[in-house]
Interface confidence: low
Amino acid sequence: DAHKSEVAHRFKDLGEENFKALVLIAFAQYLQQCPFEDHVKLVNEVTEFAKTCVADESAENCDKSLHTLFGDKLCTVATLRETYGEMADCCAKQEPERNECFLQHKDDNPNLPRLVRPEVDVMCTAFHDNEETFLKKYLYEIARRHPYFYAPELLFFAKRYKAAFTECCQAADKAACLLPKLDELRDEGKASSAKQRLKCASLQKFGERAFKAWAVARLSQRFPKAEFAEVSKLVTDLTKVHTECCHGDLLECADDRADLAKYICENQDSISSKLKECCEKPLLEKSHCIAEVENDEMPADLPSLAADFVESKDVCKNYAEAKDVFLGMFLYEYARRHPDYSVVLLLRLAKTYETTLEKCCAAADPHECYAKVFDEFKPLVEEPQNLIKQNCELFEQLGEYKFQNALLVRYTKKVPQVSTPTLVEVSRNLGKVGSKCCKHPEAKRMPCAEDYLSVVLNQLCVLHEKTPVSDRVTKCCTESLVNRRPCFSALEVDETYVPKEFNAETFTFHADICTLSEKERQIKKQTALVELVKHKPKATKEQLKAVMDDFAAFVEKCCKADDKETCFAEEGKKLVAASQAALGL
């Protein structure tokens, strides 16, 4: 429904607090380098303007679109050209091209300093001195580092962040109370950001149809008792929500997400029996809870799929009349019967079914041609099952750190041109699949593992897209969304790679490594491992293991020494020489 003033409509729907928070997120996701104070000033100006429109929707400029209003505001930033370079050219464009231009300049890996956590007392003082600024700063810092973070979900994180400080800053042992909560929020936040990044990549790189197919499969697994029409409605509404958020339309996105949560809760009897608890919560918690809700039980006595999709003489007629709907029904029926399959596997099966019908419905005897289509599914199902089995066995044998190292070696040999920080980050995340999913029973392993790997490989794809260096990565990332993981799995050692020149500086370490956290120390060692493989791609597992064991012993020895720096300098030279000899460098 059209409103005289879109900005007034959203301000009234969302309330001032959410309006301001969402505008701050939007601005920080677009202008990732701008100082906090500049963004707060812009947000306050927009908010004051919105209030004038609430008072009188016919007031000057109140009829302008949100993109026009926000874009005009962003383009008033004085240092736009100096700070952002060619992004300033966006301001010469008209809407909608101007917004598209801003979107294209979002940076998945902005050159921003690492967030260092201050002392607990310092944080608590800042929280008590000015709670509003403290929480705004949290939104700003997360949003600028994660330009595709799901904005309404970031409001939920901010609410939990505030609750953590409210509780823990009064506790006897503030640190013991607060630090685990902040660690949990950080880890969950990174996971949430990566999951949303995949949704946006799906929409932006592969289109609405690809996202809808993903949503049909996932919602059908989650709500197997819901009718197809109900799932279809939810899919369309969910697609609108994510299209808006991925497109920078954060006010509309948050508003529509709230409407969707309301609809789901009002209609939970026809959707899922698992929604009751979620629907009793306040809005932000409710939306989060619905998004994470467990799969409902499958209806008893579901008939065989073969009757409607293989044995029926009307398969080609039904397919021809409404192809996407028929395929949507196939996906819905298959997914609701298979909560044990990953979404990407279900999409591969649907694609195979579609390809078969395209071929067979043009054949002389269509039924004869597609009669064995379900047999084609068997190898597609077995491939991820076998891969997960093998990797979980390896994980159980090695533990997380060494499993990550095995993946680091594997992926560096596949795509050695990729930057070392990206290989370390991606391989560490790939390795986390073990502790995340291998503990699950068989029926939950595949959806956990393969859908998680899709999220992690998308991180590789978006980071690589910024600075493309490997045709193999580009190929696996762009050819098929659902076949990305099999594509990377199938890559062998890159025989065309010319090994990196040996540089002793890469393997020079200092006493500062001793004061690092265990995680940071692991990253240092894993960085060295990647560099070793880049120097000697044909090194065997045994050779690499020997060098890494020597390296671990070297770090341990020097960190215990009285004169740490001298130890690192002298023993380091010996280690480099021994490693060169061991690897034949």
Partner: nanobody, 115 residues
């Protein structure tokens, strides 16, 4: 392919009634929204009434109490009963049906309210 055909339009005097029908030919599964929109000359197309998968209805403020939307799921039909028609209701009326496959529109049927 799915095709929508509207019928029931025509010329009617102010205060009169008309019943518009829309039928979907071709198989269309999983309908979650059926609606009627209208477009008067020189104006934008606007929602008149809609009915969702759960049967809940929505009406434009200008037609509330005068128009009633209904659907027949078994026949993929949607109807618009228009009573107490006014000259301002003159427009081309379009039927809209949505499902997971897309958004389907009819060609429109002319409604003219004039004495």
């Amino acid at each position: 392919q799915v095709q929508l055909v509207e019928s029931g339009g025509g010329l009617v005097q102010p205060g009169g009634s008309l019943r518009l029908s829309c039928s979907a030919s071709g198989s269309i599964w999983g309908i979650y929204h059926m609606g009627w929109y209208r477009q008067a000359p020189g104006k934008q197309r606007e929602l008149v009434a809609s009915i969702t998968v759960d049967g809940s209805t929505h009406y434009a403020d200008t037609v509330k109490g005068r128009f009633t939307i209904s659907r027949d799921n078994s026949k993929n039909m949607v109807y618009l009963q228009m009573n107490s028609l006014e000259p301002e209701d003159t427009a081309v009326y379009y039927c809209d049906i949505r499902n997971v496959g897309g958004d389907y529109w009819g060609q429109g049927t002319q409604v003219t309210v004039s004495s």
